[in-house]
């Protein structure tokens, strides 16, 4: 289970945002961000130091329809 | 091509530091993960951390925390590991390695040649 | 962390056989498995990724398959090239770790 303060890395966090974002896809780092390519992303936010769920859904390619 | 090339091996006492460079060439520096890994006399290898040469952001294995530090220089395109308070049991061959995968993955595809560390006394 | 337990330690084969070598994981890591070669005073190369995924530039007569917590590397027509060392390692959470190693040696 997917839990606050956890650090997910490799295979768990694409597993997870696999899940989290389901058909809609995802991004290693967010497409309005201009910065260097890796400088910051969400290896850096979620392997590096710990995220949440509102932040990893923060990379889902499209937001989710609301029904 | 690309090509990782590692400082020359190192004698040290223990209690001592040791700091090993890794130059990289034949490709952008910033875009790809530097992992270390060690691999002691005739035993296996073991992963010690990761760094993002692009903003330096690091993270190391819970078993080095504390004596472990991986930098880099952009201008030189040159990562660094430096392990302090050193002991016998960290007489090893270090090695960088390039993660080939945006995710850091741990799928390394071009390693340095290898510095041999040894500490005795 | 997460446990990897390679089998056989070493194997005696001939050029031209086929080879197995089995990695086990403590707990269930998908596909997420790497196999490198390693040969005497060299760095380890990358073979295999993500369980069955070829690295370009090795022969395929390199093949991975397994998910979950097991996993099988065979070399098919083995040649004088391929006797050395050979390591799995997971790459599903950190701290990434190693199996033991499976040395395959010439009979």
């Known amino acids: 289970a997917y839990g606050p303060g956890e650090t997910l890395c490799g295979g768990e966090l694409v597993d997870t945002l696999q899940f989290v974002c389901s058909d809609r896809g995802f991004y290693f780092s967010r497409p309005s961000s201009r910065a260097n390519r890796r400088s910051r992303g969400i290896v850096e936010e979620c392997c590096f130091r710990s995220c949440d769920l509102a932040l990893l859904e923060t990379y889902c390619a499209t937001p989710a329809k609301s029904e | 091509q690309v090509q990782l090339v590692e400082s020359g091996a190192e004698v040290k006492k223990p209690g001592a530091s040791v700091k090993v460079s890794c130059k990289a060439s034949g490709y952008t520096f910033t875009s790809y993960y530097m992992h270390w890994v060690r691999q002691a006399p005739g035993q296996g290898l073991e992963w010690m951390g990761i760094?993002?040469?692009?903003?330096?952001?690091?993270s190391y294995a819970q078993k080095f925390q504390g004596r472990v530090t991986m930098t880099r220089d952009t201008s030189t395109s040159t990562v660094y590991m430096e392990l302090s308070s050193l002991r016998s049991e960290d007489t090893a061959v270090y090695y960088c390695?390039?993660?080939?995968?945006?995710?850091?993955?741990?799928?390394?595809?071009?390693w340095g040649q290898g510095t041999l560390v040894t500490v005795s006394s | 962390d997460i446990q990897m337990t390679q089998s056989p330690s070493s194997v005696s084969a001939s050029v031209g056989d086929r080879v197995t070598i089995t990695c086990r994981a403590s707990?269930?890591?998908?596909?997420?498995l790497v196999w490198y070669q390693q040969k005497p005073g060299k760095a380890p190369k990358l073979l295999i990724y993500a369980a069955s995924r070829l690295q370009s530039g090795v022969p395929s007569r390199f093949s991975g398959s397994g998910s979950g917590t097991l996993f099988t590397l065979i070399i098919n027509n083995l040649q004088p090239e391929d006797f050395a060392t050979y390591y799995c390692?997971?790459?599903?959470?950190?701290?990434?770790?190693f199996g033991g190693g499976t040395k395959v040696e010439i009979k």
């Open positions: 390692q997971q790459s599903n959470s950190v701290p990434l770790t």
């Open positions: 760094i993002n040469p692009s903003g330096g952001s690091t």
């Open positions: 707990q269930g890591i998908s596909s997420w």
């Open positions: 390695a390039r993660d080939r995968s945006i995710a850091a993955m741990g799928w390394f595809d071009h």
